[in-house]
Each structure stands twice: as C-alpha cells, then as structure tokens.
C-alpha cells in the first residue's frame, strides 16, 4: 500500500516518501526505491534556510550602498544576508530594503530613544520642568535651570521650548 503521508523531513512524490534536502542544499532529483534524494549545495551567493525540495537556491540579498544600505551579517548557504543602514539612516521596513535619514526632534520635544540602523528616532514632548530649544536627533529634554541653587529668582518662566530666565533677588523686600 503506497503511503499517503510521510515522516518529518520527508515529502511525498509519486506514492513514495523521499527525504527533503537539508538547509543549504537544493533538490537535484527525487529519490527512488533504490536511490536517496539527490541534493546539491547552494553556490556562494545563494542560500536555502529550511529543509526543502526547492530546485533553485535563493539569491542572497544585496545591500545596495546607493540606497544607504550596508552588510550587517554576511549570508551563508543556510542564511540570507542581513542589511542595515549607514550611520544617520534607518530602514524603511522590517525587511530593510532602503534607508531614510533619522528624524530630528523639534523644539519642545526631546529624544526618548536614539535611532539605530533599523529604527527611527523616538521623540517625546518635554514635560513641565524640561525644555528643548533645538531640532536634534540626539538631545534629550533638559531640565530648567534651578534659579534657587544660584541664589537667584525666576524672572521669566520656562516653557517646553525655553529655559527659565533667572535674575537677582529683589533687594527692596
């Protein structure tokens, strides 16, 4: 009775269970009753990352420098190349097919998380007591100056975009 299902790492072909090719190898010829599955290693620029019956290996991803990409991890016969973005840029998608410049946090916002090759800058509004007066991809919200510690008084209140202005104590009091 021919099989209708096969074991793990096997496939059914013409009523026969054949071994799948291991990662890093492609299928050349199905097995027979007498011969094991014929598999062949992928070439240097190719890979297959699963047990498979593929007749062609997949091409390694190309990290195109014209798109701001660079190699983070070189591909093997079993893994694809991993691309990342050059300094100052990050991926536009999870598959990292192109790069865009990191965004800057506008005045009134500070950097919560600095961008990486794969993620953009995360900004947060400066809370009360903090400010940012620059457009920056690195600077966090800075605390207002403490006039009291300098034996000064607040002459002008701070905002999320400006520091407080300190002045001398009113001597007439």
């Amino acid at each position: 009775e021919p099989p209708t299902a096969c074991r793990e790492k096997q496939y059914l072909i013409n009523s026969q269970c054949c071994s799948l090719c291991q990662p890093g190898q492609k299928l050349v010829s199905d097995c027979t009753e007498f011969t094991e599955t014929e598999c062949l290693p992928c070439s240097e620029s190719e890979f297959l990352d699963t047990w498979n019956r593929e007749t062609r290996c997949h091409q390694h991803k190309y990290c195109d420098p014209n798109l701001g990409l660079q190699v983070q991890q070189k591909g093997t016969s079993e893994t694809d190349t991993i691309c990342t973005c050059e300094e100052g840029l990050h991926c536009t998608s999870e598959s990292c097919e192109s790069c865009v410049p990191h965004r800057s946090c506008l005045p009134g916002f500070g950097v919560k998380q600095i961008a990486t090759g794969v993620s953009d800058t995360i900004c947060e509004p400066c809370p009360v007591g903090f400010f940012s007066n620059v457009s920056s991809a690195f600077e966090k919200c800075r605390p207002w100056t403490s006039c009291e510690t300098k034996d000064l008084v607040v002459q002008q209140a701070g905002t999320n975009k400006t520091d407080v202005v300190c002045g001398p104590q009113d001597r007439q009091r």
Epitope: N14, T32, E33, F34, E36, E38
Partner: antibody
Framework: QVQLVESGGGVVQPGRSLRLSCAAS????????MHWVRQAPGKGLEWVAV????????YYADSVKGRFTISRDNSKNTLYLQMNSLRAEDTAVYYC??????????WGQGTMVTVSS | EIVLTQSPGTLSLSPGERATLSCQAS???????LAWYQQKPGQAPRLLIY???SRNNGIPDRFSGSGSGTDFTLTISRLEPEDFAVYYC??????????FGGGTKVEIK
Amino acid sequence: QVQLVESGGGVVQPGRSLRLSCAASGFTFEKYGMHWVRQAPGKGLEWVAVISYEGTSKYYADSVKGRFTISRDNSKNTLYLQMNSLRAEDTAVYYCARDTSRGHDIWGQGTMVTVSS
Amino acid sequence: EIVLTQSPGTLSLSPGERATLSCQASQSVSYNYLAWYQQKPGQAPRLLIYGASSRNNGIPDRFSGSGSGTDFTLTISRLEPEDFAVYYCQQYSDYPPFTFGGGTKVEIK
C-alpha cells in the same frame, strides 16, 4: 568527473562462473542505487539487475534469477555482478548504470562477456 | 511486465530533416516514468529524455519528448550528422523488470 568503469569480462565456458566489477568515482556512490544492463551482439538493451544504495533491496530479470547475484561494497565504491552457471545466451556487453528518478543517467563503457566452449 | 514496442525499426533520413520516433507501452506507464536513450556504435547509451518530456543536462533542444499513458514520442527537430544512432525507450515505473524497447535506428538516407 562522474565515472563508472567495468572490468572482469572475458571468455568463459558454459556452466562456469565470472565476477564483473564496476568502479565508481566522482559522486557519492553510497547514495545511489546501481543497475546492470546487458547487450547481446547486434541486439538491443536488456536490464539485468538492480541494487539499492545500502544493498538491502535487489531485483533480477527472470532470465538470470537464481544464477546471477548483484552486490556492492560502498567502502570501495564498487558494484559487483557474480555470474554462475553461464550460458551461451549470456554472451553480451555488460554495462553498469547509476539509478536516479530520471532513469539511468550515468553508464560505464561496458565489459564484454563471451560464453563459448 | 510492461512491453515497449518501438517503431519504425529503421528511419532513413537526411541531415536537416525531422525525425519522429514512437514508443508504445502494453499498459499505462505510471507518472510518465519513461526515458529515451541514444546509443552510437561501440559506445554506452546516453540519457536524453526522462519523465517522458524533460531533457537531461547538456542535451540540445532539438531533442524533445512527448506523450503519456501508453503512447510516447521522441522528436529530433533538425537532424545533425551526430544524431544518426540507435534510440531506445525505457520504462522505470513498473519493475521488475525495467524494460527497454527494441530500438529505432536512425540512418543517413
């Protein structure tokens, strides 16, 4: 390169024995089934026997069953055909061939066996 | 046992002509497990076509196979001088035995 080379042929008297060898190179011999196919002078191809890659499964043509034995030594990359009780009708060129799901994709150059008194 | 009958026995043609060789099976060949081989005098057979219609590696595209079930055809679109030889079909679906056809000789007219 992938190659099969037969040897052991010759002239032998009826009723006697002969052992043919087929030396394989250029591929992983232990992964492939192997066949013997023969061709009588001026005639067509006749399949003789097959053996599986690990040697456990063997089949024979009715014309040689009980007289011929196919075997292999994977450590020596060699296929054998032990031929006993030879008859005049066994006279032929004997080829070894590699088994695949594509048919017999690699053949040796053949070795001539002549059974004559 | 599947019996394969090849026709014609001999085909006399000139270079550049089209050759059509037939192979008829006594019962259906499962999965189209039918191969075609070429044999020249003093040489071993060479696998041309497998699975009835797939060309083996390195075989020129003037060779093509077709058919299914019990009727199969090998076509050589334009005969080259090196194509004059004997051609055998073989079934490898039902065994034992693996059977060959009687052969078709393609000779120069």
